[in-house]
Interface confidence: low
């Protein structure tokens, strides 16, 4: 899976969309999880309604909401009041029994609030000491990581 970058401004809301094949994933609940390290597990943040037919109902866990358009095939995650610690690698998942299929890998980047007195060029990435090779940040809502980019820095 390629990784898609979604940029949001600190203090504001960020909407992440994960398109999928509605036929293939018919009847499946969805989830949003946070990747813990390059090879680490994906820790569940929030999942859609326990009853698949009610997946359109928005479910919240803290400041993160999820809703699923099962006919159109779009999973939408809302990160409210975006904070620097929200930056990181996430996954949209389709659940099937004990299995989870990755719908999309998402890198959330948090831009400083331009109205804040801090450096307006600040950009937060996952982990205080972690950096990205050649991040090629564009001022767009979302993009795919370019070839050669890595969602986590290499481990020695």
């Amino acid at each position: 899976h390629n990784t898609t970058v979604f940029q949001g401004v600190a203090g504001q809301s960020l909407q992440v969309s994960c398109p999928y094949d509605s036929m293939k994933h018919w009847g499946r609940r969805k989830a949003w999880c946070r990747q813990l390290g390059e090879k680490g597990p994906c820790q569940r943040v929030v999942s859609t309604h326990n009853l698949w037919l009610l997946s359109f109902l928005r479910r919240w866990n803290g400041s993160t909401a999820i809703t699923d358009d099962t006919l159109g095939g779009t999973l939408t995650i809302t990160l409210r009041n975006l904070q620097p610690h929200d930056a990181g690698l996430y996954q949209c998942q389709s659940l099937h029994g004990s299995e989870a299929d990755t719908l999309r890998k998402v890198l959330v980047e948090v831009l400083a609030d331009p109205l804040d007195h801090r450096d307006a060029g600040d950009l937060w990435f996952p982990g205080e000491s972690e950096s990205f090779e050649d991040a090629h940040v564009e001022h767009s809502i979302s993009r795919s990581l370019l070839e050669g980019e890595i969602p986590f820095p290499p481990t020695s």
């Epitope: 094949d21 036929m23 293939k24 018919w26 009847g27 499946r28 609940r29 326990n50 009853l51 698949w52 037919l53 659940l95 099937h96 029994g97 004990s98 299995e99 299929d101």
Partner: antibody, heavy 123, light 112 residues
Framework: QVQLVQSGAEVKKPGSSVKVSCKAS????????MNWVRQAPGQGLEWMGR????????NYAQKFQGRVTITADESTSTAYMELSSLRSEDTAVYYC????????????????WGQGTLVTVSS | DVVMTQTPLSLSVTPGQPASISCRSS???????????LHWYLQKPGQSPQLLIY???NRFSGVPDRFSGSGSGTDFTLKISRVEAEDVGVYYC?????????FGQGTKLEIK
């Protein structure tokens, strides 16, 4: 109407590979999972794996992992199952079977099956 | 993997009499979407398997109403209200709640 037509019987040597085809018609091939199930002589049914032709997504039973490859050609609505490093225990009838869809919620049941392909592994 | 266990492994029934096959799974077959993906297939002699019942109790198209399925969680039953000569073959229960999909060992139905 839905039809799954499989390739003919094969006789193979131990250590070789076999590739069985399954041509589908009468439904949207790309948007239904296709499964492969085998049945050794006088034995029960054993699920090998599946493919979603729309994007090539596959799942395999652990037992066959590394030895089986399931592919699909959307242009010809044909699914393929290739089994390598054949041994005598692989002598079986191999079936392709598509998954039924029943809204709301996929039923995940195999509603249409191919006629089966007998693969005999013998030296 | 989910292990499916069928009982009995064979049964001989007089035409017109009822028959019942039990199927037990090693873990619950309730999917996260609340559906239960337990199905029943019949393989007649010399033929490919055919779907009888899907999702516990739904008869597939063309299946006579003398066939019925019931159960929940880990225990399931296939019933034939009045066995007919054409019902001979091997009956398999199968789960597709979890990958890998698995089948029971099969129950051979014969006519007395």
């Amino acid at each position: 109407q839905v039809q799954l037509v499989q390739s003919g019987a094969e006789v193979k040597k131990p250590g070789s590979s076999v590739k069985v085809s399954c041509k589908a018609s009468g439904y949207a091939f790309s948007s239904s999972w296709m499964n492969w199930v085998r049945q050794a002589p006088g034995q029960g049914l054993e699920w090998m794996g599946r493919i979603y032709p729309g994007d090539g997504d596959t799942n395999y039973a652990q037992k066959f992992q590394g030895r089986v490859t399931i592919t699909a050609d959307e242009s010809t609505s044909t699914a393929y199952m290739e089994l390598s490093s054949l041994r005598s225990e692989d002598t079986a009838v191999y079936y392709c079977a598509r998954l039924l869809r029943n809204q709301p919620g996929e039923s995940y049941a195999m509603d249409y099956w191919g006629q089966g392909t007998l693969v005999t592994v013998s030296s | 993997d989910v292990v499916m266990t069928q009982t009995p492994l064979s049964l001989s029934v007089t035409p017109g009499q009822p028959a019942s096959i039990s199927c037990r799974s090693s873990q619950s077959l309730v999917h996260s979407n609340r559906y239960t993906y337990l199905h029943w297939y019949l393989q007649k002699p010399g033929q490919s398997p055919q779907l009888l019942i899907y999702k516990v109790s739904n008869r597939f198209s063309g299946v006579p109403d003398r066939f019925s399925g019931s159960g929940s969680g880990t225990d399931f039953t296939l019933k034939i209200s009045r066995v007919e000569a054409e019902d001979v073959g091997v009956y398999y229960c199968s789960q597709s709640t979890r990958v890998p999909y698995t089948f029971g060992q099969g129950t051979k139905l014969e006519i007395k």
